[in-house]
């Protein structure tokens, strides 16, 4: 169970002291993945950090990625994992440390000169071949948005919402994810009831826009839980 | 490093809405957590909201928990917290603070390295 992976790393990351003043807050972190996890000031080794649980890469950090943390355990039991440096195998990109993607289920460095072609080509063959995702689709990647020189526009070929211009947001388009437009007052959007079912969407919609939230629409209290409209109201 | 600034706070009611927004120089913003902390005169700087990178885990301290929003715009490096139904006693300084988001944990619980300046809210009863 997720309590038992839990609890087996009893020391849990200490808040950084409040006390100081804004001008001087500390100083950064950084630990190589897979080795070292940060924890509040100090340093602490893997054994000793408290994992995360997940249910999308994106309630990880950006060196990590959501896994089971045991080969063929429970799907339901989901942590946050150190992401793979290069050379290591992966399955999809969200796997790959920084400056690297899942190409042919090895993560490699996301050269620039060559990146782009080769990273929408992947994203295709990620799909379809036996190095596909475990669900079947891709997440949140940790490549660089700096590697794009240009933001995406509507339906660029994307890999976060960072790759796209403003107004935009990178949301899964069939077994692809595509820039699509930030959702506006009253158009409809997807409420998630449990955390993770939207990896079920095929058609993914973009969050509301700023000032706006995904609620239930008023005349449609009414109905039942599943028929319930959901829309961008002002908060 | 990231340079924070947060717009211009301002006198409100109470019972009314304010809305603040943290706009990050530098690239490292969407790879960043984002947190907004307040210090009351008097008072120790306490934590009210924070997002991870991806916008996708929030958390809100229970005194502002259904009144406060905390967004991002990663295309537009900003941070924004809509603060509505406010109280005398949210009048504070307001700071934005950023860290690296590289491995996850509780949002209160992050090293907060970048600040802004600070602006000032105050809530009239």
């Known amino acids: 169970t997720l309590n038992s992976v839990l609890n087996s790393n009893a020391i849990k990351n200490l808040p950084p002291p409040l006390g100081g003043a804004a001008g001087h807050p500390g100083s950064a972190v950084s630990a190589a993945p897979g080795i070292l996890y940060p924890g509040g000031n100090k340093y602490q080794t893997i054994d000793n950090y408290q994992p995360y649980p997940c249910a999308e890469d994106e309630e990880c950090g950006t060196d990590e990625y959501c896994a089971s943390p045991t080969r063929g355990g429970d799907a339901g039991v989901q942590i946050c994992l150190a992401c793979r440096k290069r050379r290591k195998r992966c399955m999809r990109h969200a796997m790959c440390c920084p400056g690297n993607y899942c190409k042919n289920g090895i993560c490699v460095s996301s050269d620039q000169n060559h990146f782009r072609g080769e990273i929408e080509e992947t994203i295709t063959e990620s799909f379809g071949n036996d190095h596909s995702t475990l669900d079947g689709y891709s997440r949140r990647t940790t490549l660089s948005s700096k590697m794009y020189h240009t933001k995406g526009q509507e339906g660029s070929v994307c890999l976060r919402s960072s790759d796209c211009a403003s107004g935009l947001c990178c949301a899964r388009h069939f077994w692809s994810k595509i820039c699509k437009p930030v959702l506006k007052e009253g158009q409809v959007c997807t409420k998630h009831r449990r955390k993770g079912s939207h990896g079920l969407e095929i058609f993914q919609r973009c969050y509301c826009g700023e000032g706006l939230s995904c609620r239930i629409q008023k005349d449609h209290h009414q109905a039942s839980n599943s028929s319930r409209l959901h829309t961008c109201q002002r908060h | 490093e990231v340079q924070l600034v947060e717009s211009e706070g301002g006198l409100v009611q109470a019972g009314g809405s304010l809305n603040l927004s943290c706009t990050a120089s530098?690239?490292?913003?969407?790879?960043?957590?984002v947190g907004w902390f307040r210090q009351a005169p008097g008072k120790e700087r306490e934590f009210v909201t924070g997002?991870?990178?991806?916008?996708?885990?929030?958390y809100y301290a229970d005194s502002v928990k259904g009144r406060f929003t905390i967004s991002r715009d990663n295309a537009k490096n900003t941070a924004y917290l809509q603060m509505n139904s406010l109280k005398p006693e949210d009048t504070a300084v307001y700071y934005c603070?950023?860290?690296?988001?590289?491995?996850?944990?509780?949002?209160?619980?992050?090293?907060?390295?970048?600040w802004g300046q600070g602006t000032q809210v105050t809530v009239s009863s």
């Open positions: 603070a950023s860290g690296r988001d590289r491995y996850a944990r509780e949002l209160s619980e992050y090293e907060y390295v970048w």
């Open positions: 997002i991870n990178w991806s916008g996708a885990r929030t």
């Open positions: 530098g690239s490292a913003f969407s790879s960043s957590v």
